[in-house]
């Protein structure tokens, strides 16, 4: 059986939309499937790599690599999207390409970044971990770390940094899929909202879905002990 909830929820574009949340109900009247997984149920994607989920994550990453920061022209906010999802008339799509990106580093002026920009994250304004020396952030936003400390400045002069961020990674469903969403939408969908991250590639949704002890490598499920738990 399914339990359907419908509600008006604030979505990425800053408007309220009617959203459906469909929850698979437990036939035996008990915890939901997500709760059972958290409690240690035999759920194979938590025990070993699941090809379907792996393909989903890779697909999400490929899309994210090509994303940019969509900044609303009315200064109402910004969100990481694909170009096609960013209004050409109501917003500005900040995407580095050709020769428009910043240099990889102050020591390497010739090599330009082509991957990015990312809403509220920039190698030029992140103090920790700083992009410098042997630790220059790669020219692939899906390999960027979470910035834990921004440079202390009210404004940077960069559109993608001075805007109010409207969406962050949200881990939704037992399949460990990730979407950049508003906090409201994420909570309504019973997802896990990552306030600290800017990109889906920075979070490991399956690790969150599975719970219990974190995976040794967040990309490789290793909870073999589930076989004895349930």
């Amino acid at each position: 059986a399914q339990h359907v909830t419908t509600q008006l929820v604030l979505r990425n574009k800053g408007v309220y939309e009617s959203v459906k949340y469909i929850q698979q109900e437990n036939f035996w009247i008990g915890p939901s499937s997500i709760d059972l997984i958290h409690l240690g149920a035999k759920f194979s994607p938590c025990i070993r790599k699941d090809q379907q989920i792996e393909q989903l994550v890779l697909r999400e990453r490929d899309l994210e690599r090509d994303s940019g920061c969509c900044v609303q022209n009315d200064h109402s906010g910004c969100i990481q999207t694909q170009r096609k999802d960013c209004s050409e008339t109501l917003a500005t799509f900040v995407k580095w390409q050709d020769d428009t990106g910043p240099p990889m580093d102050k020591s390497d002026l010739g090599q330009k970044r082509t991957s990015g920009a990312v809403c509220h994250q920039d190698p030029r304004t992140c103090e920790e971990p700083a992009s410098s020396g042997a630790h220059i952030w790669p020219d692939d936003i899906t390999k960027w770390p979470i910035c834990t400390e921004q440079a202390k400045s009210n404004r940077t002069g960069f559109l993608h940094m001075d805007c109010q961020i409207k969406g962050r990674p949200c881990c939704i469903s037992t399949k460990g899929s990730c979407e950049i969403t508003t906090r409201e939408y994420c909570e309504f969908m019973h997802g896990y909202f990552h306030e600290e991250a800017t990109l889906c590639s920075q979070v490991h949704c399956l690790d969150k879905v599975c719970g219990l002890l974190p995976f040794l490598n967040p990309e490789v499920p290793d909870q073999f002990y589930r076989l004895w738990l349930s």
């Epitope: 020769d99 428009t100 990106g101 910043p102 240099p103 102050k106 020591s107 002026l109 010739g110 330009k112 030029r124 304004t125 103090e127 700083a130 410098s132 440079a151 202390k152 404004r155 940077t156 002069g157 960069f158």
Partner: antibody, heavy 123, light 106 residues
């Protein structure tokens, strides 16, 4: 308000070492992303970049002069220094220090300049 | 190193006249930066990233260009615009400036 002020010996003889100081206020060189550079201008001529130093002590020099230049900083005193070894009459110029900014820029630019100090190399 | 060639070396304009000066790079650069220097004063930044106006710079100044060819335009010349203008690149070390264009008031 950001200000920079250069000071130097005014006059010195060939083969000596020129020592320049740039004292600044309104910003700190310990701030992430901050930099200060030296640029010189011989009388009636154009501008020539000499060197610059960043908050993380990263230093960059004009290769044509690198063997003679040394840039350093004293963050606590809000000062940077430039030494030019073995000066010649061709080194006579007005020396400017300038803050490096990247506000809104994909690269950087010299956004605030000092008033300059004139140095004459003469025997 | 990247050599920046400015032209003309000297030019004059009457008040209200439109003025355009150019800066040619010996190899392609991503962006150009422009500075103004009045006699007896320090340079000040006018334009960054080819076309962005620096803080406090009058809107009659504008910059454009790409690759190896860049220009600075004053839409309506004013007496206070009489100065020497330098272009500068930050595309590769050493950082280089053009020799300057001296703009005089007619």
């Amino acid at each position: 308000q950001v200000t920079l002020k250069e000071s130097g010996p005014g006059i010195l003889q060939p083969s000596q070492t020129l020592s320049l100081t740039c004292s600044f206020s309104g910003f700190s060189l310990s701030t992430f992303g901050m930099g200060v550079g030296w640029i010189r201008q011989p009388s009636g001529k154009g501008l020539e970049w000499l060197a610059h130093i960043w908050w993380d002590d990263d230093k960059y020099y004009n290769p044509a002069l690198k063997s003679r230049l040394t840039i350093s900083k004293d963050t606590s005193k809000n000062q940077i220094f430039l030494k030019i070894a073995n000066v010649d009459t061709a080194d006579s110029a007005t020396f400017y220090c300038a803050r490096i900014e990247n506000y809104g820029s994909n690269y950087w630019y010299f956004d605030v300049w000092g008033t300059g100090t004139t140095v004459t190399v003469s025997s | 190193q990247i050599v920046l060639t400015q032209s003309p070396a000297i030019m004059s304009a009457s008040p209200g006249e439109k003025v355009t000066m150019t800066c040619s790079a010996s190899s392609s650069v991503s962006y150009m930066y422009w500075y103004q220097q009045k006699p007896g004063s320090s340079p000040r930044v006018l334009i960054y990233d080819t076309s962005n106006l620096a803080s406090g710079v009058p809107v009659r100044f504008s910059g454009s260009g790409s690759g190896t060819s860049y220009s600075l335009t004053v839409s309506r010349m004013e007496a206070e615009d009489a100065a020497t203008y330098y272009c500068q690149q930050w595309n590769s070390y050493p950082l280089t400036f053009g020799a300057g264009t001296k703009l005089e008031l007619k």
